[in-house]
């Protein structure tokens, strides 16, 4: 018995059938990614995490979601405090306001 | 058994380049991060940089950003340190290190390191 | 860049102390505080990570604590194999920032 198509990643059991002379074969298949893996060809990385070099979780597709707080396309930059003049001031951490040299206030305005 | 293996350092002249390797076994090399930290003599610890093998997502210490580069071949399980344009002050050991992270947790640890290989810029 | 200060910079100390290290961080890390230990000619050792949690392997009279941006490795009761420096390190945005070190001596 031999079977030649695409079978791609998923959840769901893809049902088989084989039909001989003297016997009827059905098959239940389901191919699914290695953990942290995915796409049609399982070979799109995605961990989770929340540290320094990212702060995010994956989507069913494997794309990056930003954790509250920051953004970017590794979600490794911080979301400045709501009003924060970012031409003077800017912040490591989500929710900060810090100014450059020479500007002050709660915005660095 | 997990092991990270730095080779390549030396004595180089400044502005010279160099080349580090770090061999990694025991473990699904894409599954972490690989980062380099170095210690001056007599010093302390410090972040040089870092790659993500199964996407190369890399980020640097803006010390050595634009001198620096790292990469990773996962068929060799092998990430590499391109250092150029070195100066005296870039003279320590470099030691690669594992660094794994679980989103369940805030923050990372590195938990496994290379024994280091020594770097000397030098006239 | 977020820095790491550790005090004190060198203790001394005897078999069977307790032994109290700080680290505080310039800017709020949330819990992203790993500690290592680091002997002469030798490799740093994770202890602690995300501020409270004990690496596997690692004795359980090594304990660490904190939030924000005061953070705290005690070792409970000192053993010979404990003399060493102690790093610090926030691991909550780049680029990760490290400790001065803390040296544990012998008294």
């Known amino acids: 018995v031999s079977h030649a198509g695409m079978i791609n990643p998923e959840d769901r059991w893809k049902s088989l059938h084989f039909s001989g002379h003297v016997a009827h074969l059905e098959l239940q298949i389901r191919v699914r990614c290695d953990e942290n893996y995915y796409s049609a060809t399982c070979n799109k990385f995605c961990r989770p995490r929340n540290d320094f070099f990212g702060h995010y979780t994956c989507d069913q597709y494997g794309n990056k979601a930003c954790m509250d707080g920051w953004m970017g396309k590794e979600c490794k930059e911080a979301v400045c405090k709501q009003g924060c003049n970012l031409l003077h001031g800017g912040c490591t951490v989500p929710g900060e306001c810090r100014c450059s040299y020479g500007w002050q206030g709660r915005f660095c305005d | 058994e997990v092991q990270l293996v730095e080779s390549g350092g030396g004595l180089v002249q400044p502005g010279g380049s160099l080349r580090l390797s770090c061999a990694a076994s025991?473990?699904?090399?894409?599954?972490?991060?690989i980062h380099w930290v170095r210690q001056a003599p007599g010093k302390g610890l410090e972040w040089v940089g870092g790659?993500?093998?199964?996407?190369?997502?890399?980020d640097y210490a803006n010390s050595v950003k634009g001198r620096f580069t790292i990469s990773a071949d996962t068929s060799k399980n092998t990430a590499y340190l391109q250092m150029n344009s070195l100066r005296a002050e870039d003279t320590a050991v470099y030691y690669c290190?594992?660094?794994?992270?679980?989103?369940?947790?805030?923050?990372?640890?590195?938990?496994?390191w290379g024994q280091g290989t020594l770097v000397t810029v030098s006239s | 860049d977020i820095q790491m200060t550790q005090s004190p910079s060198s203790l001394s100390a005897s078999v069977g102390d307790r032994v109290t290290i700080t680290c505080r961080a310039s800017?709020?890390?949330?819990?992203?505080v790993a500690w290592y230990q680091q002997k002469p000619g030798k490799a740093p050792k994770l202890l602690i990570y995300?501020?409270?949690f004990l690496y596997s392997g690692v004795p359980s009279r090594f304990s660490g604590s904190g939030s924000g941006t005061d953070f705290t490795l005690t070792i409970s009761s000192l053993q010979p194999e404990d003399f060493a420096t102690y790093y610090c390190?926030?691991?909550?945005?780049?680029?990760?920032?490290f400790g001065q070190g803390t040296k544990v001596e012998i008294k």
């Open positions: 290190a594992r660094n794994d992270y679980d989103v369940r947790f805030v923050g990372s640890g590195m938990d496994y």
């Open positions: 790659i993500s093998p199964a996407d190369g997502d890399t």
């Open positions: 390190q926030q691991s909550f945005t780049a680029p990760p920032t």
């Open positions: 995300s501020a409270s």
């Open positions: 800017q709020d890390v949330s819990t992203a």
């Open positions: 025991g473990f699904t090399f894409t599954s972490y991060d």
